[in-house]
Interface confidence: low
Amino acid sequence: SAPGEDEECGRVRDFVAKLANNTHQHVFDDLRGSVSLSWVGDSTGVILVLTTFHVPLVIMTFGQSKLYRSEDYGKNFKDITDLINNTFIRTEFGMAIGPENSGKVVLTAEVSGGSRGGRIFRSSDFAKNFVQTDLPFHPLTQMMYSPQNSDYLLALSTENGLWVSKNFGGKWEEIHKAVCLAKWGSDNTIFFTTYANGSCKADLGALELWRTSDLGKSFKTIGVKIYSFGLGGRFLFASVMADKDTTRRIHVSTDQGDTWSMAQLPSVGQEQFYSILAANDDMVFMHVDEPGDTGFGTIFTSDDRGIVYSKSLDRHLYTTTGGETDFTNVTSLRGVYITSVLSEDNSIQTMITFDQGGRWTHLRKPENSECDATAKNKNECSLHIHASYSISQKLNVPMAPLSEPNAVGIVIAHGSVGDAISVMVPDVYISDDGGYSWTKMLEGPHYYTILDSGGIIVAIEHSSRPINVIKFSTDEGQCWQTYTFTRDPIYFTGLASEPGARSMNISIWGFTESFLTSQWVSYTIDFKDILERNCEEKDYTIWLAHSTDPEDYEDGCILGYKEQFLRLRKSSVCQNGRDYVVTKQPSICLCSLEDFLCDFGYYRPENDSKCVEQPELKGHDLEFCLYGREEHLTTNGYRKIPGDKCQGGVNPVREVKDLKKKCTSNFLSPEKQNSKSN
């Protein structure tokens, strides 16, 4: 029988009455248009809702927006449009919410054509009050907060000026002209590219990369012939045009651009691209597009300096047209990533890695599912996950895969079971062990969200018809109860819960439609009375992550250590609570060859843990460019995986010698780099 209909599914007692007492409806006094919602701060309960409605007139479009505020997680809303003088807010800039719990909000207003500059409304008290500020420029982008100091803002103007504010948008200063792209780095540093000959597009590949560490008092040119740049973890990347042709290469810096090394990655041509898929302080996943319009490329994983790369996955799906990739970091278990490959027959298959890109495999077939018609062998097939690509292709997939760091091991995703992704209506699958095993959780597409750190999963069926039913599970998706939250169905538009999955409140957004009007409506349901008591020690059980063979002494070892977690028992119906902290006990493992990636010039044959020399490099000295000097690499083919904590055991030798020879990348060498002050 389907999940949730088994006899052993324990019913949550009197849940209808409990939920009915905790269901709060709010009808917004608005014509439909569009709605956007932002949470202000963490655990504050403050939500801002901006509704906008465009009335097309003969000559122009008349816009109206309203601003609403809740301070009880969406149960009640107050119209605060008067705090922003009933001004029309530009939705394309969204609501710029400050980092952490700064309580800062910036709204960008629509201004009339002839005005000297734009207008913003600023709040630093969680949107209780707003200050109107007229800008000396027209903003092109949303205001960007410095991650270190929420009083520091930067923005680009429509005339490509780089503007900075040091007092949360009160006063603005243009610190540079002709700027294409600007980003905050660490320590309030700003990196930006500039053009010399007319425009960003015209100068692509001839841009300069600049840095300011003092908010525009002084500058340093840290790169030339730049195509683009990006930041990931502690790495600064730039793609740089080659001297002789139209190809470009990735250069990397770990010291904010003072010194650069050429990454050991293939160069790319005009039609190709590089993409940083994921990065942390240890390493980076880099996608390198294949020549031609193939829709795929190769994933490489870096060493701890971001310089030497190992091939991780071939034929990685990444469309050039829509820029879609299914690459997903499974945040509920360390080392796990899921993505899609485009196989030779053009079908799309899902792959998973449990060791940060060292090995990729297919997802195990769920126990309670059969292989579909894409499977050659009806008894052997895999689960294939729908993610961004399927959504872009307008398949019936309302949501991407979901995982939360504090809901350990839980992954929820739409998928199909066969040899490749199927275009049939997908079902929803859940893994409770970070992707090792899967179970069909719900039939057909659903919206889903995780509450109370995994203590509750909520789902709503994806339907073109109006809905009035929500489903919830208190046992990680094994059994489901349904609750009718309103007598009159609504056209559903989205589920909203506080980021971080610690809340017990869920808001269901939609609109009601009558003959004459349609209005926005939200229903906020608080599940606190379903989970009546706080969880105690007896409600948790010890779980070894990445466990595949309990008999093996090294069972659970991933990246050199294993972790035991305290996890809520599926049978326990209790509150983890807002202050819940994941309890884990790590222990170091002995090193094995699995703890090493293949070094530059080496590769791992399929199903082999040994690294062998690349045939084309056999007998050659391994030399590469590092910080503008040529280095000689003495290696037996292995290097420690970044972030791997193993000790003892296998210990392959690796040594890098400085050859004292100059080698140039296309960057200015450090001693020639120029600085200037304002």
């Epitope: 292989c371 018609a373 398949l395």
Partner: antibody
Framework: EVQLVESGGGLVQPGGSLRLSCAAS????????MSWVRQAPGKGLEWVAT????????YYPDILKGRFTISRDNAKNSLYLQMNSGRAEDTAVYYC??????????WGQGTLVTVSS | DIQMTQSPSSLSASVGDRVTITCRVS??????LAWYQQKPGKSPKLLVY???NLADGVPSRFSGSGSGTDYTLTISSLQPEDFATYYC??????????FGQGTKLEIK
């Protein structure tokens, strides 16, 4: 062995109704999508309707929407097609087929429906 | 809706011949295509799914190829039992999952 056996075909007056059944055996019925396909005499195959494994999702070509209804009873391993407001152009052999994804992998022997006065 | 154009509509061939039937689709269907065989008075039988994969029990003289918008069913050496009508069908995106109009393969 997978088996699909259709029944319920026969002569029906224009404007009349008919309910076709398909009995499934030899496989786990409740995890497969199912479809109906028809074939008018001397003509090609025409897809009629599809239903998801749990019966939640149903699909029809636009020209048949509103007149035809596909349904299933997983407890009885049975698939149904309710035909209303019969027209002469509905005269065909109606096949039920197992539809797990990118193909219809097993078909019944078909049942003939004739709409005529 | 996706349009399917199957060609030829009929063809005569002899035992031992190599025969090719094509199916052209109005947009990229990413290999989501099936081929069926139907003999007179019988129900259709699945031959190939996902453009290139042979269904269980189908002789290896049958093969499917193609990607994007152009797909082919090939019979490498025609046998007497292969004379039948062949249909392609797409399964891309949302319904309708249209069939091609069919190719009747007759004995020369």
């Amino acid at each position: 062995e997978v088996q699909l056996v259709e029944s319920g075909g026969g002569l029906v007056q224009p404007g009349g109704s008919l309910r076709l059944s398909c009995a499934a055996s030899g496989f786990t019925f409740n995890i497969y999508g199912m479809s109906w396909v028809r074939q008018a005499p001397g003509k090609g195959l025409e897809w009629v309707a599809t239903i998801s494994s749990g019966g939640i999702y149903t699909y029809y070509p636009d020209i048949l929407k509103g007149r035809f209804t596909i349904s299933r009873d997983n407890a009885k391993n049975s698939l149904y097609l309710q035909m209303n407001s019969g027209r002469a152009e509905d005269t065909a052999v109606y096949y039920c087929a197992r539809h797990p994804g990118g193909a219809m992998d097993y078909w019944g022997q078909g049942t003939l429906v004739t709409v005529s006065s | 809706d996706i349009q399917m154009t199957q060609s030829p509509s009929s063809l005569s061939a002899s035992v031992g011949d190599r025969v090719t039937i094509t199916c052209r689709v109005s947009e990229n269907i990413y290999s989501n295509l099936a081929w069926y065989q139907q003999k007179p008075g019988k129900s259709p039988k699945l031959l190939v799914y996902a453009a290139t994969n042979l269904a269980d029990g189908v002789p290896s003289r049958f093969s499917g190829s193609g990607s994007g918008t152009d797909y082919t069913l090939t019979i490498s050496s025609l046998q007497p039992e292969d004379f039948a009508t062949y249909y392609c069908q797409h399964f891309w995106g949302t319904p309708p999952w249209t069939f091609g109009q069919g190719t009747k393969l007759e004995i020369k």
